[in-house]
């Protein structure tokens, strides 16, 4: 079976999935698509790295830039640095510019909805 | 103005491979992916893949995995479709065409490939 | 694959007068969280390369005159053309991006009667 056949039968047991499962599946060549991404918990879809997203969509992850307004891709976005959202090559922006640490702080981020951000 | 500009009609024997190039301009050539839709004689249009001019990943149509390979030039904003193993029924015009957001908002000229022996 | 039927395959309309041409898909392109379908029409007049009208099944492309619309959801979607000019005779084709491979309809032929 191919990445793309266990995608078909496992989607519909996606919408609760935690990051680590996420994690894995990006490993799997699953090419998931855009509608089932935006399905996934926010919380779960947040921690992801670029070049996990970019696994987990394979040829959807085009689709970013036509969804960049709603969640989680917004929220997504705003987590990412911006140097890896250039490597997608969709013109993204939004994401942490250069040379800012990213400081995890989970009241601070439960209060904005956006993580602190710390310059140079 | 955003222009896409690809190279000449190829005629080919079969068993060859052919290699089409489509020129980019008037655009950052690193924000938007390049698709390839071909169209045989009289007949519809059929997606063969896309890629990423930013990081050069490319995804293709199974029906062609085999057989196609896209590349893609930064210094010269140029992306590279090349088809192996022709047969008569890849006579068709190959045509790039850059993503507006998923859908094809910009398209080539196209390029007939011929593939006769 | 995501199949995509049109119809009529061929269809003649008086100047003026509206055209309607129809898309089914053998599965849903909408996304629920967005409410965008992905889906997109396409006209590609003789000789010439194909030209974007509408994407998410009915948000006219910059430069598309108004006559052109786009409408449906899910499965089921329709392109008009309200008063049909000399100028918009042409193949007209439907295509899914929900899911690769992207996939086009058979294309449908509007001339003049």
């Known amino acids: 079976m191919n990445g793309s056949e266990y995608f078909v039968k496992i989607q519909s047991f996606l919408g609760g999935a935690p990051t680590e499962d996420l994690k894995a599946l990006s490993q799997q060549n699953v090419s998931m698509d855009l509608a089932t991404f935006m399905k996934l918990r926010t919380d779960a879809v947040l921690p992801l790295t670029v070049a996990e997203v970019q696994k987990l969509l394979g040829p959807h992850v085009e689709g970013l830039k036509a969804e960049e307004r709603h969640r989680p891709v917004r929220d997504w976005i705003l987590r990412q640095r911006q140097d890896d959202l250039d490597t997608l090559g969709l013109g993204l922006q939004g994401g942490i510019p250069n040379g800012y640490l990213v400081l995890d702080l989970s009241m601070q981020e439960a209060l904005s909805g956006t993580p602190c951000l710390l310059g140079p | 103005e955003v222009q896409l500009v690809q190279s000449g009609a190829e005629v080919k024997k079969p068993g060859a491979s052919v290699k089409v190039s489509c020129k980019a301009s008037?655009?950052?050539?690193?924000?938007?992916?390049m698709h390839w839709v071909r169209q045989a004689p009289g007949q519809g249009l059929e997606w063969m893949g896309n890629i990423n001019p930013s990081s050069g990943d490319s995804y293709y149509n199974e029906r062609f995995m085999s057989r196609v390979t896209m590349t893609v030039d930064k210094s010269t904003s140029t992306v590279y479709m090349e088809l192996s193993s022709l047969r008569s029924e890849d006579t068709a015009v190959y045509y790039c065409?850059?993503?507006?957001?998923?859908?094809?908002?910009?398209w080539g000229q196209g390029t007939l490939v011929t593939v006769s022996s | 694959d995501i199949v995509m039927t049109q119809s009529p395959d061929s269809l003649a309309v008086s100047l003026g007068e509206r055209a309607t041409i129809n898309c089914k898909s053998s599965q849903t392109l909408l996304n629920s969280v967005s409410q965008n379908n992905y889906l997109a029409w396409y006209q590609q007049k003789p000789g010439q390369s194909p030209k974007l009208l509408i994407y998410?099944?009915?948000t006219r492309e910059s430069g598309v005159p108004d006559r052109f619309s786009g409408s449906g959801s899910g499965t089921d979607f329709t392109l008009t053309i309200s008063s049909l000019q000399a100028e918009d005779v042409a193949v007209y084709y439907c295509q899914q991006h929900y899911r690769t491979p992207y996939t086009f309809g058979g294309g449908t032929k509007v001339e003049i009667k």
């Open positions: 065409a850059r993503s507006g957001g998923l859908w094809l908002a910009f």
């Open positions: 998410f099944a009915s």
């Open positions: 008037g655009y950052t050539f690193t924000n938007y992916w």
